[in-house]
Amino acid sequence: DAGVIQSPRHEVTEMGQEVTLRCKPISGHNSLFWYRQTMMRGLELLIYFNNNVPIDDSGMPEDRFSAKMPNASFSTLKIQPSEPRDSAVYFCASSL
């Protein structure tokens, strides 16, 4: 099994631009999670999906952030417009 696959591995953008992060969960997993990690704020759960349905997006109250899971094998996290403080490592995870 390839595990969870994210793209891109690295992203550099200008302030104000749109950023889209992509995730392919492990096949057969029905829950998907997006996290953000920074030195200042630690690890934050942004949103999670169960059976492609968003269950809790309270970790991203700014409407610059949006996430979709159109099918069981693909999810996107979009930031529009991006800000310098969005610089972070973004993790996607999946579980049964």
């Epitope: 704020r41 934050e44 942004l46 269950i55 109250p61």
Partner: antibody
Framework: EVQLVESGGGLVQPGGSLRLSCAAS????????MHWVRQAPGKGLEWVSY????????YYADTLKGRFTISRDNSKNTLYLQMNSLRAEDTAVYYC??????????WGQGTTVTVSS | DNQLTQSPSFLSASVGDRVTITCRAS?????IYWYQQKPGKAPKLLIY???NLAPGVPSRFSGSGSGNEYTLTISSLQPEDFATYYC?????????FGQGTKLEIK
């Protein structure tokens, strides 16, 4: 029926502390982010702080950072706001509100905080 | 911080009038949210994501706009609509409200 009930307000001297509480019922509290908003007498609304469902994401108004601390206890269905080093300008009605529809879809009735010597 | 400026700050109108309140943002926002507040009461959500009516809100209320300028329109004022209205942005923290528009009976 969604209900939010604030408590803990009162009269406090400048430099003092208060802890506000917001008791939630009628919905699954642990699934929702929560806000604090305040309104000084005769003035408009001012956003204070936000906390996500599991407390991993927290935001504050810039002017309040370091003096106010938001927290929640999902086992007690309660939201808190710890307010330290209070000033006269913190005098206001403090509301808790549930995050829903991307906004604040349910509000409590408010609790009054008066900072005066 | 993104400053929201509402205009007018005060508005006198009569029952049956069509009223429009404008909310201008100092920086572009994705959406605007509108609240109604009556004296001594908590605010009530009216419109979310710029144009969606909150549950139970009458269809005479509508919202529109994009970028830096948004509007709340009441197509035919009813006696219960006389209140203060606030816009808010959630595009970027810290979240900010407009200063309010007080709608009074003429």
């Amino acid at each position: 029926e969604v209900q939010l009930v604030e408590s803990g307000g009162g009269l406090v001297q400048p430099g003092g502390s208060l802890r506000l509480s917001c008791a939630a019922s009628g919905f699954t509290f642990s699934n929702f982010g929560m806000h604090w908003v305040r309104q000084a007498p005769g003035k408009g609304l001012e956003w204070v702080s936000y906390i996500s469902s599991g407390s991993s994401t927290i935001y504050y108004a810039d002017t309040l950072k370091g003096r106010f601390t938001i927290s929640r206890d999902n086992s007690k269905n309660t939201l808190y706001l710890q307010m330290n080093s209070l000033r006269a300008e913190d005098t206001a009605v403090y509301y808790c509100a549930r995050r829903g529809e991307g906004a604040m879809d349910y509000w409590g009735q408010g609790t009054t905080v008066t900072v005066s010597s | 911080d993104n400053q929201l400026t509402q205009s007018p700050s005060f508005l006198s109108a009569s029952v049956g009038d069509r009223v429009t309140i404008t909310c201008r943002a100092s920086s572009s926002v994705n959406y605007i949210y509108w609240y109604q507040q009556k004296p001594g009461k908590a605010p009530k959500l009216l419109i979310y994501y710029t144009s969606n009516l909150a549950p139970g809100v009458p269809s005479r209320f509508s919202g529109s706009g994009s970028g830096n300028e948004y509007t709340l329109t009441i197509s035919s004022l009813q006696p219960e609509d006389f209140a203060t209205y606030y816009c808010e942005q959630f595009t970027s923290s810290p979240f900010t409200f407009g200063q309010g528009t007080k709608l009074e009976i003429k």
